[in-house]
């Protein structure tokens, strides 16, 4: 419905005018396009006005005082539906002695400039010119709601019209709609819905999975308390007013669950004692991942099957598994958790560490002089298999010869077969210091503790061997 209040609408003499005055202003209309500024030349400046009335000091030739200038009363309140057209106006009679006047439209305290449909019409007479400023909106929107006034400037004085209140009514408009949520199973939560008119009041119905929740409507705003859900649901709210109903967006309320296992695992890099892995997390179960667990077990069927567990933060989906044996095969699984619990472990994947340099030196190194052949015999025990960190390809022997003022170091490489070597005596009456390191394709391991033997001058016999004890034999 459209209504105007508090003033009745009288048919005016000019097309589109909404005015309360029956008396025609002029009989001969003279229309112009939109001209916010109108020029009249006063013979003498006016003085400040009170309210929307200007009381000019100028008097005519007959010295009659001029009436105060004011906009005529017009319609005070226009109610109409969205998308309808509306036209309203201000009218004023201005003595012809005034020039340099300006009429402008203002809405809610801000001047309306630019592309507005404002037209000013002039109706000149002998003594006064009637001015009608019309404002039209072809298809009103809610944003057109507000208080409109005309302002007219005469001699730096401002005359202000009574406000015209435009009230655009339509379907309810949501100012707050329910939001999607992830909730714990069987736990209460709230949804909020707020809508406004005009027209008011706005009543709210809640809808769950296409069925109404409340039989009686609630006045907007409305808060729905859901006692708990066991499965995903879609909620929306209906806002009703005299113009009809508007339905909010449907929001999905998800039930938090344990996450899905990772969808990918990548072996990024392997060393002798570590494997760098990354993974792509699976579906998070509507709850952020907290941390992840990397499970590692030896893939060797003869191993005891014990599982090593490495816990890490959920980000950055990357972890370096350390303290692994060299040249070993491992099965790796990844699982991640959220607030609800742990995902299943990903399918087990296979990864291997590379060959490394041995981590310990050969054991029980024994050195003795074989004087008859002028050689030094060296014997040792290979490092324990687990600490070889690969396949032994041989040994490196360092022997340093020291006598008065002379020192020279020699290196020998020997094959992996056996655990003995023979080196030629380099210097007599000198000390020979021997150290041995095991070698794999992964590199050279640490050297054993030095073992010293004195090489006497020719003819002096000493067969006593020198040795390093095996661990635990000291």
């Amino acid at each position: 419905r459209e209504e105007a209040k508090p003033y009745p609408l009288f048919p005016g003499p000019f097309p589109g005018s909404l005015q309360t005055d029956h008396t025609p202003l002029l009989s001969l209309p003279h229309a112009s396009g939109y001209q916010p500024a109108l020029m009249f030349s006063p013979t003498q400046p006016g003085r400040p006005h009170t309210g929307n009335v200007a009381i000019p000091q100028v008097t005519s030739v007959e010295s009659k005082p001029l009436p105060p200038l004011a906009f005529k009363h017009t319609v005070g309140h226009i109610i109409l539906s969205e998308h309808k057209g509306v036209k309203f106006n201000c009218s004023i009679s201005v003595p012809n002695i005034y020039q340099d006047t300006t009429i402008s439209w203002w809405k809610d305290g801000k001047e309306l400039l630019g592309a507005h449909h404002a037209i000013t019409q002039f109706y000149p007479d002998d003594e006064v010119t009637a001015i009608i400023a019309s404002f039209s909106i072809t298809s009103v929107q809610r944003s057109d709601n507000g208080s409109y006034i005309c302002k007219m400037k005469i001699n730096n004085e401002e005359i202000v019209s009574d406000p015209i209140y435009i009230e655009v009514q339509g379907l309810p408009h949501f100012t707050k709609q329910p939001e999607s949520m992830n909730v714990t199973r069987n736990t209460a939560f709230n949804l909020t819905c707020q809508a406004v008119g005009p027209p008011e009041p706005v009543n709210i119905f809640w809808v769950q999975n296409s069925s109404r929740v409340n039989e009686q409507p609630e006045k907007s705003p409305s808060v729905l308390t859901v006692p708990g859900l066991t499965e995903m649901a879609v909620f929306s709210c209906e806002a009703h007013n005299d113009k009809g109903l508007t339905v909010s967006k449907g929001v999905q309320i998800n039930i938090k669950a344990i996450p899905s296992p990772p969808t990918e695992v990548s072996i990024r890099n392997s060393t002798a004692h570590s494997i760098l892995i990354s993974w792509v997390p699976g579906f998070d179960g509507y709850s952020p991942f907290r941390n992840c667990s990397i499970q590692v077990k030896e893939a060797d069927p003869l191993s005891n099957g014990s599982v090593m567990i490495f816990n890490t933060s959920a980000l950055p989906h990357l972890y370096q598994i350390k303290q692994l044996q060299a040249l070993a095969n491992y099965s790796i699984g990844v699982s991640c958790m959220n607030e609800i619990g742990w995902s299943a472990v990903s399918p087990w994947i296979l990864a291997s560490t590379t060959e490394g340099a041995p981590s310990v030196a050969p054991l029980n190194v024994t050195v003795f002089l074989n004087e008859s052949s002028d050689n030094v015999d060296i014997r040792w025990m290979k490092p324990p298999t687990k600490q070889q960190d690969g396949e032994l390809v041989g040994y490196r022997i360092s022997h340093v010869w020291q006598s008065a003022g002379i020192s020279k170091e020699l290196l020998e490489e020997v094959g992996q077969n056996g655990s003995r070597a023979r080196i030629s005596v380099q210097v007599h009456n000198a000390t020979c210091t021997v150290r041995i390191a095991a070698v794999t394709r992964g590199g050279v391991g640490p050297f054993s503790d030095p073992v010293k033997i004195f090489i006497p001058a020719h003819g002096w016999v000493d067969y006593a061997p020198s040795s390093t004890p095996a661990p635990g034999n000291a």
Epitope: T263, E264, V265, S331, I349
Partner: antibody, heavy 128, light 111 residues
């Protein structure tokens, strides 16, 4: 609802090129590896190619050079570019989600664990 | 390239029968168990039935079961239902190779 929809199939002359698309809904290509599989009329299934969530690609040896897998994660769509088509490429082409995938970046290969969601397929006919 | 060989290629059976399909690999499947079984009906895409040789995919009836490790695998339907007449494929991956191999298929038809 999780869904895969293939498109782009049709009749093509030998030597021609075609690009198939696989539109994904209900999950993200940035979280799942995807694969193409084909099936010639009356024949069995034949794996073509895989693209991991990060964009690494691996193909069957017979497909390398002629078939290229790619994706646009912003459009949640995967593609198969097929060049130098032959009569024996006539088949229904399926896209499928890889349920789990292990990648061996240092050795440039990866292994599919399972294909857990399939599209309806699009028919490509290569004929003069 | 590794190959998966299914047998039989065709199998005639009646509703209620116990049906067994075998899948043999020319070399060990990755991790000895990364073998899957798929069911396909005419004009439809394949559907995952079993993965990890013996784990049932979501929504698959318990009358389907899988077993095996390494190179020998079996799919069993304990009591054939009218909806089970279809073609079944095994598939798996191998270490050191990106290829995902499919078996030749076994068509289960009504006797």
């Amino acid at each position: 609802e999780q869904q895969l929809v293939e498109s782009g199939g049709g009749l093509i002359q030998p030597g021609g090129s075609l690009r198939l698309s696989c539109a994904v809904s209900g999950f993200s290509l940035s979280s799942n590896a995807m694969s193409w599989v084909r099936q010639a009329p009356g024949k069995g299934l034949e794996w073509i190619s895989i693209i991991s969530s990060s964009g690494s690609t691996y193909s069957a040896s017979w497909a390398k050079g002629r078939f290229t897998i790619s994706k646009d994660s912003s459009k949640n769509t995967m593609y198969l570019q097929m060049n130098s088509l032959r009569a024996e490429d006539t088949a229904v082409y399926f896209c499928a989600r890889v349920g789990f995938f292990v990648g061996y970046g240092a050795y440039d290969y990866g292994i599919i664990h399972r294909l857990d969601l399939w599209g309806q397929g699009t028919l490509v006919t290569v004929s003069s | 390239d590794a190959q998966l060989t299914q047998s039989p290629s065709t199998l005639s059976a009646s509703v209620g029968d116990r049906v067994t399909i075998t899948c043999q690999s020319s070399k060990s499947i990755y991790n000895n168990n990364w073998l899957s079984w798929y069911q396909q009906k005419p004009g439809k895409p394949p559907k995952l039935l079993i993965y990890d040789a013996s784990d049932l995919a979501s929504g698959v009836p318990s009358r389907f079961s899988g077993s095996g490790s390494g190179t020998e695998f079996t799919l069993t339907i304990s009591s054939l239902q009218p909806d089970d007449f279809a073609t079944y494929y095994c598939a798996g991956g191998y270490s050191g190779d990106s290829d995902y191999a499919f078996g030749g298929g076994t068509k289960v038809e009504i006797k």
